[in-house]
């Protein structure tokens, strides 16, 4: 028998490699039996993760499951970095792993560390 | 029934390139992350990589980087590595394992095969 | 890299005897999640490896309660209770919290 807590389904130590000035979406996967959660982004800086207001989010809704997306439109230089969701479920909070932008700025790409430096020198991340 | 397969030939040229195959069933490689582990004859393992398929972001042994290329094809269910410039040394037995990338839920490791590199 | 030690290298056991496998990072496997990426492999002779436990104490589905797995930060332990004649194998620590994972050199659990 399926949990019918809520699950957020990003998975641990994922990345993607996008490109400044370009549009991208960053999907949340959420899996819930009955109510929709209230579903937040945010950006870690350090150890803290700072909520992201006034940013553009919507739904999409699937059979199974739902997506609540961040919007990126435009990609810019300083959205590189991790972000995390995070759901609201019967007053617990449910958060998901953390995923990586490396967000690659096409007009000084060649001056960049590609991103398997980036991965050699994870401090850059925090 | 969950399987993963392992295949390719099992003698390979010295500075030829090794090429394997897993084929996945029974679960959805995208849910999870395909890693290529090896096993020298009577040694320990050695971790090469590992894939995500959703998205084709793959991570490498610093060991392998500069020879190994680990991709995945969501379509078929499969993951595939190839190791350049081969050497005695790459004998090995070779392993994929599919982790489940959310709550670690499963870890399957396919049966294995033997590769020789010799002339 | 980080080194997994694991000791001892071998080990010989009769069954019904309780045994404990310890494996040690150079650094801390603590994620930023908070939780440690340890996991225990089994492997039998001409067999591929086989996941035990994960996050260093969750069994796999399957695998008889006799098998515990406890530690935290870098020091990590891999207790049978009660040794079985099929628990005779090899056991892997593997890291996979940061990257290269790497796996210890193995602990050779023989009959005695």
């Known amino acids: 028998k399926e949990s019918c807590d809520v699950q957020l389904y990003i998975k641990r130590q994922s990345e993607h490699s996008i490109l400044a000035g370009d549009p991208f979406e960053l999907e949340c996967p959420v899996k819930y039996c009955a109510n929709r959660p209230h579903v937040t982004w945010c950006k870690l800086n350090g150890t803290t993760c700072v909520k992201l207001e006034d940013r553009q989010t919507s739904w999409k809704e699937e059979k199974n499951i739902s997506f609540f997306i961040l919007h990126f439109e435009p990609v810019l230089p300083n959205d590189n970095g991790s972000y995390r969701c995070s759901a609201n479920f019967q007053s617990n909070l449910i958060e998901s792993h953390s995923t990586t932008l490396y967000v690659t700025d096409v007009k000084s790409a060649s001056e960049r560390p590609s991103k398997d430096e980036m991965a050699s020198r994870p401090w850059l991340l925090y | 029934q969950v399987q993963l397969q392992e295949s390719g030939p099992g003698l390979v040229k010295p500075s030829g390139t090794l090429s394997l195959t897993c084929a996945v069933s029974g679960f959805n490689i995208k849910d999870t992350y395909i890693h290529w582990v090896r096993q020298p004859p009577g040694k320990g393992l050695e971790w090469i990589g590992r894939n995500d398929p959703a998205n084709g972001n793959t991570k490498y042994n610093p060991s392998f980087k500069s020879r190994a290329t680990i991709s995945a094809d969501k379509s078929k269910n499969q993951a595939s590595l190839k190791l350049s410039s081969v050497t005695a040394a790459d004998t090995a037995v070779y392993y994929c394992a599919s982790y489940e990338g959310y709550y670690e839920r499963f870890g399957y490791w396919g049966q294995g095969t033997l590769v020789t590199v010799s002339s | 890299d980080i080194q997994m030690t694991q000791s001892p290298s071998s080990l010989s056991a009769s069954v019904g005897d309780r045994v404990t496998i310890t494996c040690r990072s150079s650094?801390?496997?603590?994620?930023?999640?908070?939780?440690?990426?340890l996991n225990w492999l089994q492997q039998k002779p001409g067999k591929a490896p086989k996941r035990l436990i994960y996050?260093?104490?969750k069994l796999d589905s399957g695998v008889p309660s006799r098998f515990s797995g406890s530690g935290s930060g870098t020091d990590f332990t891999l207790t049978i209770s009660s040794l079985q004649p099929e628990d005779f194998a090899t056991y892997y620590c593997?890291?996979?919290?940061?990257?290269?994972?790497?796996f210890g050199q193995g602990t050779k659990l023989e009959i005695k």
């Open positions: 593997w890291q996979d919290t940061h990257f290269p994972y790497t």
């Open positions: 996050l260093v104490s």
């Open positions: 650094q801390s496997l603590l994620d930023r999640d908070g939780k440690s990426y």
